[in-house]
């Protein structure tokens, strides 16, 4: 019906306004409404001006119309020509009464379909229904996925790509781990993934200054070390260092009036030379204190070495050896005096004998046919050595003796000359001063070691070698190496160490093979004024130990492998060290600090005498131990 109406209107327009000229009223009759007429008539006049000369009145005039005028006028009522709609967005244009209607394609809106609908912002279809990314485009939209995801066939949802499955070798020697939208090449702790080589490379933590003092990097990790020999230990954080603190303070008070006889491991403590009138005779008086059973107290000789006198201790008793042109004698007598008490000793040359007194009571009288030392040129020249003798004398002794003596002397009077001159020398030298109070035992001050050569091979045993150790300890610091067996290649195949426990005021004992702890005895209260007794036995098959709390045979998966390492070392040559380690790498053992405190050691049934050591740090006291420091009311 509408199209018929349109055709009728078109016919009327042709007849009324093109074949003839029409005025506005006549045009109104064609359109039958004002809006279309008002829209049409001004444009109609423009067409007439374009194709006819002269001005037009409203009067009817007959004329030959041009074809161009026809097309001009016919176009006027079509609101869709020229196209008012947005070409991209419209689907169709409908002509209306002096108006038009643009029908939009999906995705467009507006009177002329000029506005794109943003489907991605549609509240009724959140994110355009896309699971990840919604991309709005003119007149449309599409979904897309983030990197590492692929589009599903519904064009809306995304699926994670499992790169590890796609290419199992994508991480090379590392482990591939798929994560949403990506993958990771994972390395064990202590390793970092190298993208170029597609492999896990060791992180050199040491280059990152992880440790306060010393750092040793190894594949997959690192270990911090502190210079135990300088008194440091590793802190709880396993990175920083802290001072090895004293857990049992000792009374280290000394007095310069007391001369320490064991200042040197090998050598004389004091050397004096006397030039006296020829009528003089040898005499020596002094107070003496020791727990040592053997050693040289003093040695005196003539200036030409032809005559000598040795005052020593053997088996805890005074021994005198003498030699001159007339005689050669050795005598031991009196009570045992290595009891840690002060004993007054006097040795005096009389006309026909040498008298030895302890506490003013004669214990020996040694006959002599003439003077001990022969005067020359009217003078008696005598050399006196404390706690030792010149090296060449060793071969001349009537009976060999270990000269080392851990003891003290005081109130000395030599050759009846008093102590003048000597005290001044001693006063300036701290290490010649003796401790005021001592107890029985051996003292390791935390600054050195003692070395022994011990043969651990036991031919009679099927095991081939064994190490049976008994330790009586009273530590003063909670960290240090008590005993170590060291191989020629600077490894430590076995060590017994002390470390401060994580639990307060207690210590752990570590047994280690090389740098691996094979057993840890935890939380023992060892820093007390009482000695602790520890025993352990080790051979190539077993490890047994006993502490104040328990006796046990240790067995764990790794032990046999560690004992095999020890076995290999024991078949070669090992040196035994007490109180610490020699110059081995810091990484050779779990602990490298010196032991500080008292300790007595028995190995394979033999009580070790530090005077018998191959070498010993001078500060180690072989037969005396400082007393525990007692708090006084004033202090």
């Amino acid at each position: 019906a509408n199209s018929l109406l349109e055709e009728t209107k078109q016919g009327n327009l042709e007849r009324e306004c093109i074949e003839e000229l029409c005025n506005k009223e006549e045009a109104r009759e064609v359109f039958e409404n004002d809006p279309e007429t008002d829209y049409f008539y001004p444009k109609y006049l423009v067409c007439l001006r374009s194709f006819q000369t002269g001005l037009f009145t409203a009067a009817r005039q007959s004329t030959n119309a041009y074809p161009d005028l026809r097309s001009c006028v016919n176009a006027i009522p079509d609101q869709c020509s020229p196209l008012p709609c947005n070409e991209d967005g419209y689907m169709s244009c409908k002509d209306g009464k002096a108006s038009f209607t643009c029908t939009c394609k999906p995705g467009w809106q507006g009177e002329k379909c000029e506005f794109d609908i943003n489907e991605c912002k549609d509240p009724s279809n959140i994110n355009g229904g896309c699971s990840q990314i919604c991309d709005n485009t003119p007149g449309s939209y599409h979904c897309s996925c983030k990197n590492g995801f692929v589009m599903l066939s519904n064009k809306k949802d995304c699926k994670d790509v499992d790169e590890c499955s796609l290419k199992p070798s994508i991480c090379g020697t590392a482990v591939c781990k798929n994560i949403p939208g990506d993958f990771e090449c994972e390395c064990p702790e202590g390793y970092r993934y190298n993208l170029k080589s597609k492999s896990c490379e060791d992180i050199d933590e040491c280059s990152e200054n992880m440790c306060a003092q010393l750092c040793v990097n190894y594949p997959g990790g690192y270990t911090c070390y502190c210079d135990g020999k300088k008194g440091f230990k590793l802190a709880q954080d396993q990175k920083s260092c802290e001072v090895v603190s004293v857990c049992l303070p000792l009374n280290l008070d000394t007095k310069y009036e007391l001369l320490y006889l064991a200042e040197q491991f090998a050598g004389v403590v004091l050397y004096l030379k006397f030039r006296l009138p020829e009528i003089s005779r040898f005499s020596a008086e002094f107070d003496f204190r020791t727990y040592d059973s053997e050693g040289v107290i003093l040695y005196a000789e003539s200036i030409d070495h032809s005559a000598w006198l040795l005052i020593a201790l053997r088996g805890g008793k005074i021994e005198v050896q003498l030699k001159n042109e007339h005689t050669s004698k050795i005598t031991t007598g009196g009570d045992v005096i290595n009891n840690g008490l002060w004993n007054m000793v006097s040795v005096e040359e009389l006309e026909h004998s040498i008298s030895i007194k302890i506490a003013k009571e004669a214990v020996m009288d040694i006959n002599k046919p003439g003077p001990l030392f022969k005067p020359e040129n009217g003078l008696l020249e005598t050399k006196v050595y404390f706690a030792g003798f010149p090296r060449k004398v060793e071969s001349e002794l009537i009976k060999p003796i270990n000269p080392r003596l851990d003891g003290c002397i005081r109130s000395w009077n030599l050759m009846k000359q008093g102590a003048s001159g000597i005290k001044e020398i001693i006063q300036e030298k701290q290490n010649k001063h003796c401790l005021v109070t001592v107890e029985k035992g051996s003292y390791y001050p935390g600054s050195g070691i003692a070395q022994f050569h011990i043969d651990y091979n036991n031919v009679s045993s099927a095991e081939g070698w064994h190490v049976n150790v008994t330790l009586n300890i009273r530590p003063s610091t909670g960290t240090g190496v008590m005993l170590a067996l060291v191989s020629g290649n600077n490894t430590v195949p076995f060590a017994v160490s002390l470390v401060d426990s994580t639990s307060e005021k207690s210590q752990d004992i570590l047994l280690s093979v090389e740098n691996t702890v094979i057993y840890r005895i935890q939380a023992l209260s060892l820093c007390s004024d009482q000695q602790s007794h520890l025993e352990f036995r080790v051979n190539r098959n077993n490890l047994e130990l006993s502490t104040p709390l328990k006796i046990e045979t240790i067995s764990h998966e790794d032990l046999q492998r560690q004992l095999a390492v020890l076995d290999k070392a024991m078949k070669a040559k090992v040196a035994t060290y007490l109180g610490g380690l020699p110059d081995v790498p810091f990484s050779a053992t779990p602990v490298n600090a010196f032991y500080n405190g008292c300790m007595e050691v028995n190995i394979n049934g033999v009580q070790l005498d530090l005077d018998e050591a191959i070498s010993k740090h001078n500060d180690i006291r072989a037969h005396s131990c400082p007393s525990v420091w007692k708090k006084t009311k004033n202090s």
């Epitope: 897309s144 589009m151 066939s153 699926k159 796609l166």
Partner: antibody, heavy 117, light 113 residues
């Protein structure tokens, strides 16, 4: 929407290398697995291989020794190279997008490559 | 590799009548993720293939509902309920369960009687 267009020479001499490029338009190259498929005249479809945008590839075992697929993400293109071609490599070569549902959602129009001297 | 076998090779059909194409795999196409990645493609004469069905039975966008897929494990079927003239062409089944190794069936030609 994503569209694919193959390009490359239509004639290759025997023993030479066949090289084709597929240009991806209207979408991200990271959103699909990109494949090459060929169809000899009058025959069925043969999968050649695929590439994922990070460079992961896999090939049909029967062609593996001669085929290389590469990707240029900056140009939104991926390419196919087949070495030592013979007349048996004459085919229409299609590039196609494989979705996460492992289906070929999008296909190029295909390009005929003739191997002849 | 999985081998895909299609039957029949050719299927002459009367317009408006149903058609059925079978596809069999040499081993189960059930993936470890539980999905079965079997799809159907249509290739009209002189045109590239286009996706019809994915994951056995899911119709791809724009595909008329006269196309349907069914099956499980190793046996699968594509059905056209009423064949139209525009349905003429070769139909391929394809497995992607073994992705990234993909294999096509040999194809079935659908023609009008």
């Amino acid at each position: 929407q994503v569209q694919l267009q193959e390009s490359g020479p239509g004639l290759v001499k025997p023993s030479e290398t066949l090289s084709l490029t597929c240009t991806v338009s209207g979408g991200s190259i990271s959103n699909y697995y990109w494949n090459w498929i060929r169809q000899p005249p009058g025959k069925g479809l043969e999968w050649i291989g695929y590439i994922y945008y990070i460079g992961i590839t896999d090939y049909n075992p029967s062609l593996k020794s001669r085929v290389t697929i590469s990707v240029d993400t900056s140009k939104n293109q991926f390419s196919l190279k087949v070495t030592s071609v013979t007349a048996a490599d004459t085919a229409v070569y299609y590039c196609a997008a494989l979705s996460g549902d492992h289906a070929f959602d999008i296909w190029g129009q295909g390009t005929l490559v003739t191997v002849s001297s | 590799d999985i081998v895909m076998t299609q039957t029949p090779l050719s299927s002459p059909v009367t317009l408006g009548q149903p058609a059925s194409i079978s596809c069999r795999s040499s081993q189960s196409l059930v993936h470890s993720d539980g999905n079965t990645y079997l799809s159907w493609l249509q290739q009209r004469p002189g045109q590239p293939p286009r996706l019809l069905i994915y994951k056995i039975s899911n119709r791809f966008s724009g595909v008329p509902d006269r196309f349907s897929g069914s099956g499980a494990g190793t046996d699968f079927t594509l059905k056209i309920s009423r064949v139209e003239a525009e349905d003429v062409g070769v139909y391929y089944c394809m497995q992607a369960t073994q992705f990234p190794h993909l294999t096509f069936g040999g194809g079935t030609k659908v023609e009008i009687k």
